[in-house]
């Protein structure tokens, strides 16, 4: 059965450059290993932001990526990307691969447009 990946269409990053959004897939397959990849689309280019494999025991992901974190629960991944700046504004896609047990499935969300606004620099204080 085809898997559908859903994610919010728009998210606004915080003033500290942190954006969080869920990535969910359905139907909920009985899967021991799920690989989640966050991709950024700019024009026709697609680049990997971060990727991780979640398991029943390993529900905290992206340990190799300083700017990504995520938690996995059943068929929902809560993703957080930090260190974002205005130039990072763009469409972020969530790709889900059901790795084990077989069969392998792949699904892709439609993307979350993350808007990042750089904070205004603090004015110099005169004493």
């Amino acid at each position: 059965e085809a898997i559908q990946v859903t994610q919010p269409s728009v998210v606004l990053a915080s003033s500290h450059g942190v954006a969080s959004f869920p990535c969910e897939y359905s139907p909920s397959h009985n899967t021991d290993e799920v690989r989640v990849t966050v991709l950024r689309q700019t024009n026709d280019q697609m680049t990997e932001v971060c990727a991780t494999t979640f398991t029943e025991k390993n529900t905290v992901g992206f340990l190799d990526y300083p700017f990504c974190s995520g938690t996995f629960n059943e068929s929902r991944v809560n993703l957080t990307i930090q260190g974002l700046r205005a130039v990072d504004t763009g469409l972020y896609l969530c790709k889900v691969e059901l790795m084990y047990p077989p069969p392998y499935f792949v699904g892709m969300g439609n993307g979350t447009q993350i808007y990042v606004i750089d904070p205004e620099p603090c004015p110099d204080s005169d004493f």
Partner: antibody, heavy 123, light 107 residues
């Protein structure tokens, strides 16, 4: 240039075993997933098995599950297909093919193929 | 398993003709579809991946389109070297099934 050369085919009796090899050259073997695809005489293509670039995942067609095992030896740049409990319907040309393991939107596809090795299962 | 069907199973055409081959999946496979060309006694050759991406070195007269369950391979102007059998393949889920093939021969 990319080269894939299959070997190990031949005539074998039903119920027996055979191991096919695929020697790869011209690319970084350990960076690619690898597939086996077969083609019975006068028939179409049938996907058999795939092994991920790092050997972490292996998937099989239902028709060979439990009888065939795909493996790889990156130190020898070689892909293998161990076939056991062979049946007449396994008679085919067996192709190995490489697949870029990291496909963002493209899925997995076989971009280079060997010329194939013929396996005939007959008593 | 996902079943792939192709139509027509065979067709006769002349050099210069526009040829269209269709492939249908038994369930949605997004854009995870590839097209291969095979000539007698030869290994298959990748033409199109991801439904519409042209493989490097493949002539631009080949194009692919479609998404979901219905896909098309088009040869805009058939050349003598294009007479062959064409297969579609889904890579959405294992087993990565092929279609039964479409044989293109000379009218």
């Amino acid at each position: 240039q990319v080269q894939l050369v299959e070997s190990g085919g031949g005539v074998v009796q039903p119920g027996r075993s055979l191991r096919l090899s695929c020697a790869a050259s011209g690319f970084t073997f350990s960076s690619y997933g690898m597939h086996w695809v077969r083609q019975a005489p006068g028939k179409g293509l049938e996907w058999v098995a795939v092994i991920w670039y790092d050997g972490s995942y292996k998937y099989y067609a239902d028709s060979v599950k439990g009888r065939f095992t795909i493996s790889r030896d990156d130190s020898k740049n070689t892909l293998y297909l161990q076939m056991s409990s062979l049946r007449a319907e396994d008679t085919a040309v067996y192709y190995c093919a490489r697949a870029p393991h990291y496909a963002i939107l493209t899925g997995y596809y076989e971009d280079y193929w060997g010329q194939g090795t013929l396996v005939t299962v007959s008593s | 398993d996902i079943q792939m069907t192709q139509s027509p199973s065979s067709l006769s055409a002349s050099v210069g003709d526009r040829v269209t081959i269709t492939c249908r999946a038994s369930q949605s496979i997004s854009s995870y579809l590839n097209w291969y060309q095979q000539k007698p006694g030869k290994a298959p050759k990748l033409l199109i991946y991801a439904a519409s991406s042209l493989q490097s070195g493949v002539p631009s007269r080949f194009s692919g389109s479609g998404s979901g369950t219905d896909f098309t391979l088009t040869i805009s102007s058939l050349q003598p070297e294009d007479f062959a059998t064409y297969y579609c393949q889904q890579s959405y889920s294992t087993p990565f099934t092929f279609g039964p093939g479409t044989k293109v021969d000379i009218k």
